[in-house]
């Protein structure tokens, strides 16, 4: 005989679940579908990931996202996780927003980002709901820097980057300071491939770095080089 009252709780149909913390009166729900749309936009050594929420929320509002990263070496095709070497604008697990910026990416590396959507019952199934996007980093190469000449009070420095990348650079920024003085530094900007740093102290080592400035932001910086001005006694002008 049918019971005079409805049941206090119902078993969930296949593929639907109640999370342990869900009240018995709550409807059965299921994991979300994958994030609906994912884009990865490269900007120098950064990538901005944006996605839209799953079309099917599974009947729940507690959706969070996780981002994972894989990098692949173009020469060998080998791939591996890159969580240790990149930096996220916020912790990449348990995200509630639908965007994140990933920085410190390496030039000429291929990256694949996976964004997974989860809700309160995702842990009750083995399948995952995710979408992936790949991006190649084409940040400019670090400039190769040379000391062309020096005097007691100046250093002439030149640099180069591969010709195909030169058209992307609108200026170069040369930062220099006395070795041992980390409190103050000087910056020179130039459109050319060389600069003479004047008004320097004799017989002194300077730390010099060159960085390309592109439309996307800063290119990779050069090594920090140590160049030394001539001492007053052994000075021939601009000798190397």
């Amino acid at each position: 005989l049918p019971s005079p009252e409805g049941a206090t709780s119902c078993e969930c149909e296949e593929g639907f679940f109640r999370a342990p913390q869900d009240p018995a009166s709550m409807p059965c729900t299921r994991p979300p579908s994958a994030p609906h749309y994912l884009t990865a936009v490269g900007m120098g050594a950064k990538v901005e990931l944006r996605w839209t929420p799953p079309q099917d929320s599974g009947g729940r509002e507690d959706i969070v996202y996780s981002v994972t990263c894989e990098q692949c070496w173009p020469e060998s095709g080998e791939c591996g996780p890159c969580e240790a070497s990149v930096r996220y604008s916020e912790p990449p697990h348990g995200l509630t927003r639908t965007s994140v910026t990933v920085s410190d990416l390496e030039p000429h590396m291929n990256y694949t980002f996976t964004v997974e959507a989860r809700n309160g019952v995702s842990g009750l199934v083995t399948s995952r709901s995710f979408r992936t996007a790949s991006v190649s980093i084409n940040q400019t190469e670090p400039p190769k820097v040379r000391l062309e000449g020096r005097s007691t009070t100046s250093l002439s420095v030149s640099w180069s980057i591969p010709p195909p990348q030169q058209s992307r650079v609108w200026k170069y920024e040369v930062t220099y300071r006395k070795k041992g003085d980390s409190n103050s530094y000087n910056v020179r900007r130039t459109e050319g491939f060389s600069v003479t740093l004047d008004d320097l102290a004799p017989d002194t080592t300077y730390l010099v770095q060159v960085q390309a400035l592109t439309q996307e932001g800063q290119g990779a910086g050069s090594k920090v080089h140590e160049f030394q001005t001539l001492s007053p006694e052994g000075s021939g002008n601009l000798a190397v």
């Epitope: 670090p142 000391l147 070795k179 910086g221 050069s222 090594k223 080089h225 140590e226 160049f227 030394q228």
Partner: antibody, heavy 127, light 108 residues
Framework: QVQLQQWGAGLLKPSETLSLTCAVY????????WSWIRQPPGKGLEWIGE???????SYNPSLKSRVTISVDTSKNQFSLKLSSVTAADTAVYYC?????????????????????WGQGTMVTVSS | SYVLTQPPSVSVAPGQTARITCGGN??????VHWYQQKPGQAPALVVY???DRPSGIPEQFSGSNSGNTATLTISRVEAGDEADYYC???????????FGGGTKLTVL
Amino acid sequence: QVQLQQWGAGLLKPSETLSLTCAVYGGSFNDYYWSWIRQPPGKGLEWIGEVNHSGSTSYNPSLKSRVTISVDTSKNQFSLKLSSVTAADTAVYYCAKPFRPHCTNGVCYSGDAFDIWGQGTMVTVSS
Amino acid sequence: SYVLTQPPSVSVAPGQTARITCGGNNIGSKNVHWYQQKPGQAPALVVYDDSDRPSGIPEQFSGSNSGNTATLTISRVEAGDEADYYCQVWDSSSDHLVFGGGTKLTVL
């Protein structure tokens, strides 16, 4: 080919001063900054400091208050003194030569790679 | 002070490629040097200036460095490559030399 030979006391009591010397054979002593490096048992490498022919030094900040590195250009030798030792100073101590002269034609190499090492001296601090 | 971070251990099968990383803030702007140390021996330089090899070091040792990570790559790994590996840089901000904590390479 440059060779490094080092010597000094291997067993010390706490609060004593560690003293090691490294002799450089071959090569141009005056062109390089000469370093001391240590390695506690089962642990990693730790740079202690460096000296050049004129006695100019640079030290690891964590040891600076206890370290003195000096040079004797007449003998092509440099020495390490570490005062007030404790058991934490127990380690193999190495002297080392950088790969390139410190400065050549205005281009300098601080903290260059070390291509030649001494044989190492095990120093034990124990009461 | 400047810190270099290495994984404590890396395991690889013979004939495979081992990658040992060395992480540090903007390490790409510094020259990174790598050493191999076998038990009871002094360290031996295997790569300098990110990717150059001293004479006598086989081609299977190579290096790269950009951003915040430098990598020592050992291709076609053999049993004789089992050792501890250390990275090293000069920190120009504090004017002192820094070693990574070391990575033990195990050949399975």
